[in-house]
Interface confidence: low
Amino acid sequence: PTSSWNISSELNKDSYLTLDEPMNNITTSLGQTAELHCKVSGNPPPTIRWFKNDAPVVQEPRRLSFRSTIYGSRLRIRNLDTTDTGYFQCVATNGKEVVSSTGVLF
């Protein structure tokens, strides 16, 4: 029990979560591709979720996807349509803290 507590303490002591750069707003044209970048770092490595207009982003095969990157996460939308406009938020957590950033796709 003691050793388990010590390990937990060490993890808590060294854990951190930072937003490295605010998300940019994107202005683009119909039919084009837009990318939004969520630049966060942390220990343990954060879990990142994407939201559009406060709702979880649902990936669409070959059109809308997000993936982990060395700097956090990237959301890509291909073949943009008018319904894609709105505000996008990434929410990152390391299990203890939460940071978020918002960008707008015009």
Partner: antibody
Framework: EVQLVESGGGLVQPGGSLRLSCAAS????????IHWVRQAPGKGLEWVAA????????SYADSVKGRFTISADTSKNTAYLQMNSLRAEDTAVYYC??????????WGQGTLVTVSS | DIQMTQSPSSLSASVGDRVTITCRAS??????VAWYQQKPGKAPKLLIY???SLYSGVPSRFSGSRSGTDFTLTISSLQPEDFATYYC?????????FGQGTKVEIK
């Protein structure tokens, strides 16, 4: 503790102006959207306007577009609703609310705006 | 605009009753639906988000569910403090739209 406190309501004549304030505390102001929602006496909830202080993104309901302006002062953690050319149908309790992926998770206590001659 | 059609507009119930309120979205809103409780002279309070997630501090007698574009708020055993007006809201399509409200009154 997250808190939103509205102020600035009152009685105003048709055609007049008012500025509402929403003072936020207990959270990172620039990480959330701030919305204004109003409720006319005995009626339901009506969305009015929103601002995302980090990006400066704003939007308005058609019923107030061109008359109301939403803004935010990030140094004061305060959002504002400037209301011009007020009409009798703008009479309502005005609430500010914080939005997150959970919807409108925190609301202020509301401030009453009465437009009457 | 997305319409959220809420029913009934009012209902009368007794303490201990099971109460169900429904909202139908005019088109898909995924699971991005919240439910709020409002008492006279007070601000709305969040009860349920993402259609079925119970917000922190809300009693477990409140629950939400989704079936396609139909959303339901259920109070399993109505308590005296639950007499209030309830609103649904979709927040999938910006900026979000509210239902008309359901007033729960004492029978």
């Amino acid at each position: 503790e997250v808190q939103l406190v509205e102020s600035g309501g009152g009685l105003v004549q048709p055609g007049g102006s008012l500025r509402l304030s929403c003072a936020a505390s207990g959270f990172t102001f620039t990480s959330y959207g701030i919305h204004w929602v109003r409720q006319a006496p005995g009626k339901g909830l009506e969305w009015v306007a929103a601002i995302y202080p980090h990006s400066g993104f704003t939007s308005y309901a058609d019923s107030v577009k061109g008359r109301f302006t939403i803004s935010a002062d990030t140094s004061k953690n305060t959002a504002y609703l400037q209301m011009n050319s007020l009409r009798a149908e703008d009479t309502a309790v005005y609430y500010c609310a914080r939005t997150s992926y959970r919807g409108f998770d925190y609301w202020g206590q509301g401030t009453l705006v009465t437009v009457s001659s | 605009d997305i319409q959220m059609t809420q029913s009934p507009s009012s209902l009368s119930a007794s303490v201990g009753d099971r109460v169900t309120i429904t909202c139908r979205a005019s088109q898909s809103v995924s699971s991005a639906v919240a439910w709020y409780q409002q008492k006279p002279g007070k601000a709305p309070k969040l009860l349920i988000y993402s259609a079925s997630s119970l917000y922190s501090g809300v009693p477990s007698r409140f629950s939400g569910s989704r079936s396609g574009t139909d959303f339901t708020l259920t109070i399993s055993s109505l308590q005296p403090e639950d007499f209030a007006t309830y609103y649904c809201q979709q927040y999938y399509w910006y900026p979000g739209t509210f239902g008309q409200g359901t007033k729960v009154e004492i029978k």
